[in-house]
């Protein structure tokens, strides 16, 4: 299971963010940690595939995008659909499978040098990256290093974790993605346990670092299993 959490990796002792509400189709939820939005199977491998409702591409898995299941169908009913392979029709990058991007309505290989220009300017100037992953696994092929100057530092906007410098991952922050530190041993992490219980989140921590996994903290006894504290621990 991949790890993420509502709170930003950087938000440790701050009170819940105030003054902002995330508007979801048909709902109004406060932008406070602890609230999960409906939908999505973005964090788990699905053994028996079921269509998951979604509102954004990033609520879906690495090889999926969010759209209406029927051509010209009701825009309010969207599910995670399988990504489109090379030479298939597309409307945006997220529709194309990893290693490809959408150019002139067709999925083409992102290995080509012109992909850099297609994403616009530099990676650090991009922002509403609704189609990028919430984890360390790259949704889109890493861009050739000659195409842009440097890896994103902490606080830089990113498309995927490979855009960030070593020790950082690309994690959701409000309506964007920014480079945040990969979690160290003993730091709090979140493990999503149930399918469909982990919709689009406002904040997100990175995954645990190399050699670590997100497990229930020993000696942390609480009444409810679901509220037990998870931390990054050695394998």
């Amino acid at each position: 299971t991949l790890n993420s959490v509502l709170n930003s990796n950087a938000i440790k002792n701050l009170p819940p963010p105030l003054g902002g509400a995330a508007g979801h189709p048909g709902s109004a939820v406060s932008a406070a940690p602890g609230i999960l939005y409906p939908g999505g199977n973005k964090y788990q491998t699905i053994d028996n595939y079921q269509p998951y409702p979604c509102a954004e591409d990033e609520e879906c898995g690495t090889d999926e995008y969010c759209a209406s299941p029927t051509r010209g169908g009701d825009a309010g009913v969207q599910i995670c659909l399988a990504c489109r392979k090379r030479r298939k029709r597309c409307m945006r990058h997220a529709m194309c499978c990893p290693g490809n991007y959408c150019k002139n309505g067709i999925c083409v290989s992102s290995d080509q040098n012109n992909f850099r220009g297609e994403i616009e300017e530099t990676i650090t100037e991009s922002f509403g990256n609704d189609h990028s992953t919430l984890d360390g696994y790259s949704r889109r092929t890493t861009l050739s290093s000659k195409m842009y100057h440097s890896k994103g530092q902490e606080g830089s906007v990113c498309l995927r974790s490979s855009d960030c410098a070593t020790g950082l991952c690309c994690a959701r922050h409000f309506w964007s993605k920014i480079c945040k530190p990969v979690l160290k041993e003993g730091q709090v992490c979140t493990k999503h346990r149930r399918k469909g219980s982990h919709g689009l989140e406002i904040f997100q921590r990175c995954y645990c670092g190399e050699g670590l996994s997100c497990r229930i903290q020993k000696d942390h006894h609480q009444a409810s299993n679901s509220s037990r504290l998870h931390t990054c621990q050695r394998h």
């Epitope: 995330a22 609704d130 606080g155 309506w175």
Partner: antibody
Framework: QVQLVESGGGLVQPGGSLRLSCAAS????????MTWVRQAPGKGLEWVSG????????YYADSVKGRFTISRDNSKNTLYLQMNSLRAEDTAVYYC????????WGQGTLVTVSS | DIVLTQSPATLSLSPGERATLSCRAS???????LAWYQQKPGQAPRLLIY???NRATGVPARFSGSGSGTDFTLTISSLEPEDFAVYYC?????????FGQGTKVEIN
């Protein structure tokens, strides 16, 4: 090159409505979230609202929540701000911008709320 | 809300001089989620720095950002005539996104 052009500003009476538009070009619009920021005459900058790339998720400052609605039409590469129940204190130049640390800005459109 | 306080309100300097602008947050930002903008009269703001210390595309090397926690600084190593403007800091740590009240850098 990236261009953002706002329109729709003007003079409106308190309690009235206006709809601002921001036409975007030079980048793949639906890949990017967008933001509205305003600046009252002679004052500083104030964040108003933000919207994700697909338009499914929106965020508002407390001062405008319930009165303003941000939206976008990705087929037209256009961002909108519907402003209802306008107050004198909403008088400002309204800018649309791209990114959470706004890397591109429009030239702004002036909204004047006065009787 | 996180309040950003910029100081000084006005900085009177001559071309070639070094300008140091301060931005203090009312709460620890924990991470470098801070940006700096330049605004000239009648114009939209322009992004200079993001992530506290990263220069935006096309911004001259004389502009640099530093700081962490609650104290952040924008430094202009040697003022050029076109640098006289108002400078704003902005945090994107938490909602609402907030800006400082601005520092005006004027010609002495």
């Amino acid at each position: 090159q990236v261009q953002l052009v706002e329109s729709g500003g003007g003079l409106v009476q308190p309690g009235g409505s206006l709809r601002l538009s921001c036409a975007a070009s030079g980048f793949t619009f639906n890949n990017y979230g967008m933001t509205w920021v305003r600046q009252a005459p002679g004052k500083g900058l104030e964040w108003v609202s933000g919207i994700s790339g697909s338009g499914s998720y929106t965020y508002y400052a407390d001062s405008v929540k319930g009165r303003f609605t941000i939206s976008r039409d990705n087929s037209k590469n256009t961002l909108y701000l519907q402003m209802n129940s306008l107050r004198a204190e909403d008088t400002a130049v309204y800018y649309c911008a791209r990114t959470i640390y706004m890397d591109y800005w429009g030239q702004g459109t002036l909204v004047t709320v006065s009787s | 809300d996180i309040v950003l306080t910029q100081s000084p309100a006005t900085l009177s300097l001559s071309p070639g001089e070094r300008a140091t602008l301060s931005c203090r947050a009312s709460q620890n930002l924990f991470s470098p989620y801070l940006a700096w903008y330049q605004q000239k009269p009648g114009q939209a703001p322009r992004l200079l720095i993001y992530g506290a210390s990263n220069r935006a595309t096309g911004v001259p090397a004389r502009f640099s950002g530093s700081g962490s926690g609650t104290d952040f600084t924008l430094t202009i190593s040697s003022l050029e005539p076109e640098d006289f403007a108002v400078y704003y800091c902005q945090q994107y740590m938490t909602l609402p996104l907030t800006f400082g009240q601005g520092t005006k850098v004027e010609i002495n």
